[in-house]
């Protein structure tokens, strides 16, 4: 077995980090392929091991547990396939960021003929994500997802108000979020479950 | 505006004890691997501690292992470094730093407090 | 410890480009991405130039730049000032845990 190139890895800046590793040839992962991985700087850091699973027939991933990592961590990886080591690297989870999805997406009717989408971010007070992250909120018709719009939340509350005129009336609607870190380097979250609503407003007398 | 501010250097005989301290501020210090540097009169610098964010990790430089602990507070957002057996070449000068990044990346220092020691 | 080797000296003209050196082993510069670059003006805290051989730190200008080859790391001031003479140091990881640090080079501008 060989290892093709470097693995790809993030981390959810929270709990895990996840690698995968492309391989030359088919592979069980978990009854082949060992990673050890363990924080470095510190001599009497905790040596831990991640039992990868196959993402593909030639694919591993390995999902590793980094509880409350923060920016000045690095982990020395080592990944085994029985007394041979395959792959030596480092990986720091400030590095490559991948927040977790943003949940419970809901839609609130608003007094003055708008929308308020609301959703939840998932890091408590004390990750740096807490007030880091931006939003992404795509908003397609159900029926075509090719006629979108999209909206840029840059500011840290997560909601985002929008006229209900700016969408037709008489059309179902489909809005998802992802969030991304502005201050560490990484790549947008998975998109949010989306939620489908109606979009129903009477138009004024001119327009009918 | 991140400040690091040490005390509680001074004049010590050989053999004897001290504990200098480092008060943080302007920043999320529970976030944040810290160190001490030292650097001896008309000397270079010096590597002597680290200490993991959450502060159960700790690492030493060989010439103070035994002798130095390292320790924080994040309740007080406080650095400390508790050196006893003080030798003669532990006289120098000793900063406070803060990590960021790896851990050779030291991107805010204190002022320093002096600690001689001599008989 | 044994340090990473630094030249105790180098000068360069105004304007001019100068490199200072940091030699070490497999274990330490040749085996990391850690290495950073501190100056140190006198009766002053060092303050940080460059972390992980290469990333400008925050307000540093271009001017400065680091690099590594094998077992050496290498800081390069182009453009160089008066205001640059000072005391350049660099830090290394070394596979033991520790850190070390060259034993500092004084920049003079000629």
């Known amino acids: 077995i060989k290892v093709l190139g470097e693995p790809t890895c993030f981390s959810d800046y929270i709990r895990t980090s996840t690698c995968e590793w492309f391989l030359d040839s088919a592979v069980d992962c978990s009854s082949q392929l060992c990673l050890h991985y363990r924080l470095m700087f510190f001599e009497f850091s905790e040596n831990l091991t991640c039992i990868p699973r196959n993402s593909a027939s030639t694919v591993c991933v390995c999902h590793m547990e980094m509880n409350r990592p923060v920016q000045s961590d690095r982990y020395q990886m080592e990944l085994w396939a029985e007394h041979r080591q395959l792959w030596q690297g480092s990986f720091s989870p400030s590095g490559n960021v991948k927040p977790l999805a943003p949940d419970n997406l809901t839609l609130h009717t608003n007094v003055s003929d708008e929308w308020l989408l609301t959703w939840n971010n998932l890091y408590p007070s004390n990750n740096l994500l807490y007030k880091d992250l931006i939003s992404m909120v795509n908003i397609s018709r159900e029926d075509n997802p090719a006629e979108f719009i999209v909206y840029n939340v840059t500011y840290k509350e997560p909601r985002l108000s929008f006229p209900i005129n700016i969408l037709m009336s008489g059309v179902y609607y489909t809005a998802r979020v992802r969030v991304r870190s502005q201050i560490l380097t990484g790549t947008w979250s998975e998109w949010s479950p989306s939620i489908t609503w109606y979009n129903h407003f009477q138009l004024p007398l001119i327009q009918r | 505006e991140v400040q690091l501010v040490e005390s509680g250097g001074g004049l010590v005989q050989p053999g004897g004890s001290l504990r200098v301290s480092c008060a943080a501020s302007g920043f999320t210090f529970s976030s944040y691997y810290m160190a001490w540097v030292r650097q001896a009169p008309g000397k270079g610098l010096e590597w002597v501690s680290h200490?993991?964010?959450?502060?159960?990790?700790?690492q030493y430089a060989d010439s103070v292992k035994g002798r130095f602990t390292i320790s924080r507070d994040n309740a007080k957002s406080t650095l400390y470094l508790q050196m006893n057996s003080l030798k003669p070449e532990d006289t120098a000068l000793y900063y406070c730093?803060?990590?960021?990044?790896?851990?050779?990346?030291?991107?805010?220092w204190g002022q320093g407090t002096q600690v001689s020691v001599s008989s | 410890h044994s340090a990473v080797t630094q030249p105790p000296s180098v000068s360069g003209s105004p304007g001019k480009t100068v490199t200072i050196s940091c030699a070490g082993t497999s274990s330490d510069i040749g085996g990391y991405n850690y290495v950073s670059w501190y100056q140190q003006f006198p009766g002053t805290a060092p303050k940080l130039l460059i972390y992980e051989v290469n990333k400008r730190a925050s307000g540093i200008p271009d001017r400065f730049s680091g690099s590594k080859s094998g077992n050496t790391a290498s800081l390069s001031i182009s453009g160089l000032q008066s205001e640059d003479e000072a005391d350049y140091y660099c830090a290394s990881y070394r596979s033991n845990n520790n850190i070390v640090f060259g034993g500092g080079t004084h920049l003079t501008v000629l």
């Open positions: 730093v803060r990590i960021y990044g790896d851990a050779t990346s030291y991107d805010y």
């Open positions: 200490i993991h964010a959450g502060g159960s990790l700790t």
